[in-house]
């Protein structure tokens, strides 16, 4: 399974902070950021970076203890840009993360100085056993840039 | 003010088990991490592990792992941690401390640390 | 794991003197989310450790302003601009960016 969050300020479940998704061993968490077409918003673009971070971190929006670890950066608001994170027990890269069944996992953004944007805060749900590829339903939309 | 009191000194048998406890005072137990540290004379301090009361979220050291197993009981804001196939290795004082969060990040308040001593 | 190592063991001094402790780990310190979790405690005789410094240079509450510490990357010290007798004990580094968190071997502050 595949689960795209569309991650930026107009998803209000991201916005408000209970947007869960419940995730298998070998699903991919796909996060697409923020894009643009001609100008933008006059605010200017929403740019970030995502981080993994505890509860205490989630809960305060904070990724500035020793278990906030920057992933993503979306700093290019004309572009496509998309990252993914493999739900998998063991990762083979060393910045990887290993992701175990029953748990839960935390991501927020944090906005750049510049950006227009708002704290995103999201939960990942990881559950009992592997799939197989398909996709699944997005968080958002691509309209909600 | 904030307290950590630790349990008495134990003194057990080669491949027993202890569970030694730290009780928590003068702050919300739930919001902060307990970590457990070891020290043996002459040989530093090593890090065990931390443990959340907020979720009871754990992590270990792989050296301890399947040998320390932290919990705790938030009713009575103490933390436990069990120590398990001991060997003469193991004996040390084991030492709990809370970490304060932003912008620290650092274990502020200790106990005042529990004597294990692994003999027949 | 990361191997953090001090130096001196140990480090003779006379009162009023300046100490300056050594930390190197063997490698960066510096966190994926930027920040540098690197700290120093003082653990005198029959006591727990002390915080004294945390997040290589800010000194906690408490902590009297002759101690400081500086750094970045692998390379740590601690300073004492002038050392009194409730200073004496062992001073270990410890990071908190890698996991295990691990600490250094101590060094110990004594009376020439």
């Known amino acids: 399974l595949r689960h795209v969050v569309y991650w930026n300020s107009s998803n209000p479940r991201l916005l408000r902070g209970d947007a869960v998704v419940e995730l298998g061993l070998n699903d991919y968490l796909d996060i697409v950021c923020p894009h643009y077409e001609g100008p933008g918003p006059p605010e200017g673009p929403e740019t970030f970076a995502l981080y993994m971070v505890d509860w205490p971190g989630y809960e305060s929006c904070q990724a500035e203890g020793p278990r906030a670890y920057k992933r993503w950066v979306c700093s290019l608001p004309f572009g496509h840009v998309q990252f993914s994170e493999k739900i998998q027990r063991f990762t083979p890269f060393s910045l990887g993360f290993e992701f175990l069944p029953g748990e839960t996992y935390y991501y927020i953004s944090v906005p750049t100085p510049e950006s227009s944007g708002q704290c995103l805060r999201l939960q990942v749900s990881v559950c009992c056993k592997e799939r197989k590829s398909e996709s699944a339903h997005p968080v958002g939309s691509p309209g909600e840039s | 003010q904030i307290q950590l009191q630790q349990s008495g000194p134990e003194l057990v048998k080669p491949g027993a088990s202890v569970k030694i406890s730290c009780k928590a005072s003068g702050y919300t137990f739930t919001g902060y991490y307990i970590h457990w540290v070891k020290q043996r004379p002459g040989q530093g301090l090593e890090w065990i592990g931390w443990i959340y009361p907020g979720n009871f979220n754990t992590k270990y050291n792989e050296r301890f792992k399947g040998m320390a197993t932290l919990t705790v009981d938030t009713s009575s804001s103490t933390a436990y941690m069990q120590l398990s196939s001991l060997t003469s290795e193991d004996s040390a004082v084991y030492l709990c401390a809370r970490e304060d969060g932003s912008p620290y990040y650092a274990m502020d308040y200790w106990g005042q640390g529990t004597s294990v001593t692994v003999s027949s | 794991d990361v191997v953090m190592t001090q130096t001196p063991l140990s480090l003779p001094v006379s009162l009023g003197d300046q100490a300056s402790i050594s930390c190197r780990s063997s490698?960066?310190?510096?966190?994926?989310?930027?920040?540098?979790?690197l700290y120093w405690y003082l653990q005198k005789p029959g006591q727990s450790p002390k915080l004294l410094i945390y997040?290589?240079?800010n000194r906690f509450s408490g902590v009297p302003d002759r101690f400081s510490g500086s750094g970045s990357g692998t390379d740590f010290t601690l300073k004492i601009s002038r050392v009194e007798a409730e200073d004496l004990g062992v001073y270990f580094c410890f990071q908190a960016t890698h996991v295990p968190w691990t600490f250094g071997g101590g060094t110990k502050l004594e009376i020439k």
């Open positions: 997040r290589v240079s």
């Open positions: 490698q960066s310190l510096v966190h994926s989310n930027g920040n540098t979790f």
